[in-house]
Amino acid sequence: LRPSRVHNSEENTMRALTLKDILNGTFSYKTFFPNWISGQEYLHQSADNNIVLYNIETGQSYTILSNRTMKSVNASNYGLSPDRQFVYLESDYSKLWRYSYTATYYIYDLSNGEFVRGNELPRPIQYLCWSPVGSKLAYVYQNNIYLKQRPGDPPFQITFNGRENKIFNGIPDWVYEEEMLATKYALWWSPNGKFLAYAEFNDTDIPVIAYSYYGDEQYPRTINIPYPKAGAKNPVVRIFIIDTTYPAYVGPQEVPVPAMIASSDYYFSWLTWVTDERVCLQWLKRVQNVSVLSICDFREDWQTWDCPKTQEHIEESRTGWAGGFFVSTPVFSYDAISYYKIFSDKDGYKHIHYIKDTVENAIQITSGKWEAINIFRVTQDSLFYSSNEFEEYPGRRNIYRISIGSYPPSKKCVTCHLRKERCQYYTASFSDYAKYYALVCYGPGIPISTLHDGRTDQEIKILEENKELENALKNIQLPKEEIKKLEVDEITLWYKMILPPQFDRSKKYPLLIQVYGGPCSQSVRSVFAVNWISYLASKEGMVIALVDGRGTAFQGDKLLYAVYRKLGVYEVEDQITAVRKFIEMGFIDEKRIAIWGWSYGGYVSSLALASGTGLFKCGIAVAPVSSWEYYASVYTERFMGLPTKDDNLEHYKNSTVMARAEYFRNVDYLLIHGTADDNVHFQNSAQIAKALVNAQVDFQAMWYSDQNHGLSGLSTNHLYTHMTHFLKQCFSLSD
């Protein structure tokens, strides 16, 4: 029996969400992140595409670049040089991987209102950026780095060995981009532009993943990507620094790797400039439980970089891997040697520490059974950070200020009481010296972006409040959402439940579990969303639940590191445990329970379906991992160790989806994958399908030709329509 949706005349005028609403992005929201260019000025692209400079203190704004100029080169992005003399305009955007893309760049001279002619930039460029001071340019073209003193000058070629799929200079290879740096670039200007640091990645010995790209031609193309899977040969990384004023003097100088790191396979994890002549590099052993932070100084006499052992700081985890998803990066204080950093305290919670000489002598700045998430800014007297401390909800984010100029340091929550019901999940963006900052609230109410005074925290103005969205939602029957927790065997399982608009506890509803569950992830967050699951609750009367089990983040190391070296066990167990608890609540139709997930979530949903519990009637896996031997080394080995006999091969073999093929016999399984998935290769689903066929297990499948891990564009519409049909059929809901 399906619950009736109409209760009174007022609700008659309201309508449920439709799938079309979701696919058209009808209820998407806007955020406002100022493009700060000084302590009190920011740039913003106006609704009519002019680039406008706003001065907070004078209240004045003026157009620095007209939409006409933007349109003349079809620019989709821009970047103002710090001396405000030039703007680069980016067009012909061509996506590569998650962060990387190539583009054509034009330089516009603001002083004469003309494009710079002569010594134009080559095309397409892989990365381009201004120096932090003046208008020097660094760019990467065909895997080599070039420097320009000024936009109209000829370039100086810094590297010469760049080669497609072999040597990458100033840009990461696939695995570093996706799993380590999370950027499209691997070069870093020193604060005043004196030096340029860059990474060189040598992929010569890395095995290549090859897949067909069908396109429209008679013969498909083969895409080849050096992609180290678990246990395979990894990229060899080197860091160089070049003097940008005298680049040909001694040329690029290599920064030495700490001896304890260089003794075996290792990664470079991040670079942070401290001053023009001091740089901080972070390195990580291939077995990712030891990280070394190394502070290096420029030796003028030798023109080299010296990294004394006394300036090496070791971070080691004895219970899991180093850091959270990534090892945290330091935020240096004004003395240019001490820094603030987030790492686990003795109780196993990630907190801010102040390191002056050694990690052992670190002073803990925050503490409690919650976690510090991000350090936004350190000024002379304040440290701004985000945490999930407030009211003990791990899925919230509030911004705090600690006064570091006074003793004892006082702590103030900047956001906790601003718009308490509407806003519980914030991020922030600070101007120079934290003179002003923008707060961006993501929910649970309609998102809102506001501008604040950095000294008083006073709200100056609303930057974006999504009024149109608010009005559009007035006649929509949105589902109800609740965030609660289950206490099971000393484990706290936070969950978010999305309930149909006229939810009635005395009735029975079909349940859909949406799972991700990857290490250091968090699904249960106090954020606003009108998406596919909102529609399923609003229109189709389903209850949807998201559960953060073991392995998820921001609740301490005990929960986070529980999955160390045994992926695919506890994440699945905890989803099953939660389902059993939901059934006990009395409003779930236990004959109509489904689970779905994407990527890591596809892996967990597949394992849950094959758990043999009989709880799930059906489920969907989109682009799932099926064996950890098929996934990237950097990610996989962080959590699983190596697939070798003397390490963790046994669990690699035990944790595959294929090993459970028989158990799919009693569930309806929909397997979906893009054939051009560069991340979780189609191989994963191909192997599941093969195992199911070999076991003579019926299942449904859908592939998306030439689509990557995101299944974007028209594929998105097809995907969600297809999954909707599948679920409605599974739950016996009429179309």
């Epitope: 420097l147 000024r150 000829p154 010469f160 005298y246 040909a248 003097y249």
Partner: antibody, heavy 118, light 107 residues
């Protein structure tokens, strides 16, 4: 348009001094390494000295080290070469040139002749 | 200091000829090699920088190649205005040095 104009050349006795100037225009002078290059009559080119953008860093050919001093005034967009203890072998046309990236001379002045003779 | 040796020191050629001048460095200078043209009574003019890059405004008949210690300047089809002296110059270590020059004369 980039322009470099030298001045200050002339006849000087051995052991004497001379100060050359180079007025720069058409580019952001303070952002570049500047240099002096000389050419003795009927001979090839010889680099003399360079100075960094801020003026704090300099370099000299062995043949002039300790006798010549290069300097600049970024507020006036002017490069200087103070030549002391001049010798007959310093006789040459002295060119002011922009030393792009410390590597190549992309713009040159027309030159100023310095003659050291008794 | 890095010595630069140019050859030949002079050559005679006709309009339309392909002309090649070589330059050898006493040690490796990577691609930090530049070529200049100088006409009598005039300042030198940059033709090629970084071994093979054509300076803006220079005709495409001029080309450069090489890396390490051996470099070449080629004029694919000599024009009347190309009769001049050509110098190579290395740009390593902030100690620029020039070759002795190659005089290209009319045959």
């Amino acid at each position: 348009e980039v322009q470099l104009v030298e001045s200050g050349g002339g006849l000087v006795q051995p052991g004497g001094s001379l100060r050359l100037s180079c007025a720069a225009s058409g580019f952001t002078f303070r952002g570049y390494i500047m240099s002096w290059v000389r050419q003795a009559p009927g001979k090839g080119l010889e680099w003399v000295s360079w100075i960094g953008p801020e003026g704090s860093r300099t370099g000299y050919a062995d043949s002039v080290k300790g006798r010549f001093t290069i300097s600049r005034d970024n507020s006036k967009n002017t490069l200087y070469l103070q030549m002391n203890s001049l010798r007959a072998e310093d006789t040459a046309v002295y060119y002011c040139a922009r030393l792009q990236y410390g590597t190549w001379f992309d713009y040159w002045g027309q030159g100023t002749l310095v003659t050291v003779s008794s | 200091d890095i010595q630069m040796t140019q050859s030949p020191s002079s050559l005679s050629a006709s309009v339309g000829d392909r002309v090649t001048i070589t330059c050898r460095a006493s040690q490796s200078i990577s691609s930090y090699l530049n070529w200049y043209q100088q006409k009598p009574g005039k300042a030198p003019k940059l033709l090629i920088y970084a071994a093979s890059s054509l300076q803006s405004g220079v005709p495409s008949r001029f080309s450069g190649s090489g890396s390490g210690t051996d470099f070449t300047l080629t004029i694919s089809s000599l024009q009347p205005e190309d009769f001049a002296t050509y110098y190579c110059q290395q740009g390593r270590l902030l100690l620029p040095t020039f070759g002795q020059g190659t005089k290209v004369e009319i045959k």
